[in-house]
C-alpha cells in the first residue's frame, strides 16, 4: 500500500525518494511518473535523471535535494487539486529485476483561509530518527565501502514523521546512508 503525503492547494508538495550512490557522482537513472509504477520505466514521466544530470523535467516538478548524493525527492510547485494521486519513484539499477519502485500517494487539501501566507517548510533531506541496520543475506566478498545504512523497509514506517519533522539536515550531516534492496 502506498505511503500517503499531504499538501494544501497553492503549497509545494514533497514526495521523498532516496538511494545510495556507489560512490559520489556514481549515479543511477531515476524516473518520476504520475500513476503507479508499471512493470518497466515510469508512466506519464514528469522528471528523469540519468547517470549525470536531470535530463527531463516538466514545469512545476523539480528536485530540491542534492540528487548527486542520492536525494531524488520530488517537489511539486504550487499544487492544485488535480495533482492528487499516485506518483512513482523508480530507481533504475542496472541489470534485470533490480529496480526499486516506490508508489507515493499525494493528497491535496483545499487551502485554509489564513490571514497571511506562511513560508513552506524546508524538507530537503530529513529523517528525524533512524535505526541503522546491516545484513542482507550472507556475508559477501564484493562490497563497496562500509557505510552505515538504512533498510528501506523502515522508510514507510517513518513517513509520517518525515512529513511533520523540522529536523531537516540531521541525517545528511550524520553521514548516514540509505540502503536499497
Amino acid at each position: 500500500s502506498e505511503v500517503e503525503y499531504r499538501a494544501e492547494v497553492g503549497q509545494n508538495a514533497y514526495l521523498p525518494c532516496f538511494y545510495t550512490p556507489a560512490a559520489p557522482g556514481n549515479l543511477v537513472p531515476v524516473c518520476w511518473g504520475k500513476g503507479a509504477c508499471p512493470v518497466f520505466e515510469c508512466g506519464n514521466v514528469v522528471l528523469r535523471t540519468d547517470e549525470r544530470d536531470v535530463n527531463y523535467w516538466t514545469s512545476r516538478y523539480w528536485l530540491n535535494g542534492d540528487f548527486r548524493k542520492g536525494d531524488v525527492s520530488l517537489t511539486i510547485e504550487n499544487v492544485t487539486l488535480a495533482d492528487s494521486g499516485i506518483y512513482c519513484c523508480r530507481i533504475q539499477i542496472p541489470g534485470i529485476m533490480n529496480d526499486e519502485k516506490f508508489n507515493l500517494k499525494l493528497v491535496i487539501k483545499p487551502a485554509k483561509v489564513t490571514p497571511a501566507p506562511t513560508r513552506q517548510r524546508d524538507f530537503t533531506a530529513a529523517f528525524p530518527r533512524m535505526l541503522t541496520t546491516r545484513g542482507h543475506g550472507p556475508a559477501e566478498t564484493q562490497t563497496l565501502g562500509s557505510l552505515p545504512d538504512i533498510n528501506l523497509t523502515q522508510i514507510s514506517t517513518l513517513a509520517n514523521e518525515l512529513r511533520d519533522s523540522r529536523l531537516a539536515n540531521d541525517l545528511r550531516d550524520s553521514g548516514a546512508t540509505i540502503r536499497i534492496g
Epitope: P21, I91, M97, L144
Partner: antibody
Framework: EVQLQQSGAELARPGASVKLSCKAS????????MQWVKQRPGQGLEWIGA????????RYTQNFKGKATLTADKSSSTAYMQLSSLASEDSAVYYC?????????????????WGQGTTLTVSS | DVQMIQSPKSMSMSVGERVTLSCKAS??????VSWYQQKPDQSPKLLIY???NRYTGVPDRFTGSGSATDFTLTISSVQAEDLADYHC????????FGSGTKLEMK
C-alpha cells in the same frame, strides 16, 4: 536458515494442468523475487519466470507465456507455478529459487537458494 | 534472448589438476554472470557471482574471471567432490544459462 520446500513429484496426463508449490522460510518472503527454472533430463537450466510477492510483479520468458502462471500467497510464504496444456516436453524437474538482486552499491543478480526440485512426468 | 555457450561439453580430470571452463555470451552482459555447481541428483548451488566474486563458503580453489562476452571458471586443483555439472548464467537481461559442462574424474 533460508529454506525452499517444494511439493512432491507429479504424474499428469497430456492436456492436463498441474500446480507446483514452493514454501519459503527463514527470510522475508515479500522482499525477494522468487524464480522458477526448468531442467529436462541431461540438459541445461531454462528460466521460466519470476514473481515478486511484495507487489505482485510477475515476469515470464517468452517461451512460457501461456504455459506457466505464477502466483504467491503472502500469508503462507508460498509461491506457486501452474503449468497448463501439458505435453511430453513439459516432463522435467522444476526448481524454485530465490533471487538476490543488485543494489546501487553491490552487484548481485544471482539465484542464491534453490528448492530441492519437483519432478513432473507427463505421460498417457 | 542472450545465448550462453559453454565449452567443453564434458571433461575428464584427475585429482589435483587445474580445470578451466569457458562460457561465451552472445552479447555484452557486463559482469552479470554467475556460475553454479550441480552435483548428481541435487539442486544447483551458487559458486561465483558478478563474474568474479566467490559466494559465501565456496572454497578458494574456485575462481571466476571475465567480462563483456568471455567468462571463465577455474578450479585450481580439482578434488573428487568437484565431480558435477557446471552451469554459467547471465542476469543482465532475463536470465539465460549455458547447456552445462560435465566434469568427470579419470
Amino acid at each position: 536458515e533460508v529454506q525452499l520446500q517444494q511439493s512432491g513429484a507429479e504424474l499428469a496426463r497430456p492436456g492436463a494442468s498441474v500446480k507446483l508449490s514452493c514454501k519459503a522460510s527463514g527470510y522475508t518472503f515479500t522482499s525477494y523475487w522468487m524464480q522458477w527454472v526448468k531442467q529436462r533430463p541431461g540438459q541445461g537450466l531454462e528460466w521460466i519466470g519470476a514473481i515478486y510477492p511484495g507487489d505482485g510483479d510477475i515476469r515470464y520468458t517468452q517461451n512460457f507465456k501461456g504455459k506457466a502462471t505464477l502466483t504467491a500467497d503472502k500469508s503462507s510464504s508460498t509461491a506457486y507455478m501452474q503449468l497448463s496444456s501439458l505435453a511430453s516436453e513439459d516432463s522435467a524437474v522444476y526448481y524454485c529459487a530465490r533471487w538476490e538482486k543488485s543494489t546501487t552499491v553491490v552487484q548481485r543478480n544471482y539465484f542464491d537458494y534453490w528448492g530441492q526440485g519437483t519432478t513432473l512426468t507427463v505421460s498417457s | 534472448d542472450v545465448q550462453m555457450i559453454q565449452s567443453p561439453k564434458s571433461m575428464s580430470m584427475s585429482v589435483g589438476e587445474r580445470v578451466t571452463l569457458s562460457c561465451k555470451a552472445s552479447e555484452n552482459v557486463g559482469t552479470f554472470v554467475s556460475w553454479y555447481q550441480q552435483k548428481p541428483d541435487q539442486s544447483p548451488k551458487l559458486l561465483i557471482y558478478g563474474a568474479s566474486n566467490r559466494y559465501t563458503g565456496v572454497p578458494d580453489r574456485f575462481t571466476g574471471s571475465g567480462s563483456a562476452t568471455d567468462f571463465t571458471l577455474t578450479i585450481s586443483s580439482v578434488q573428487a567432490e568437484d565431480l558435477a555439472d557446471y552451469h554459467c548464467g547471465q542476469s543482465y537481461s532475463y536470465p539465460t544459462f549455458g547447456s552445462g559442462t560435465k566434469l568427470e574424474m579419470k
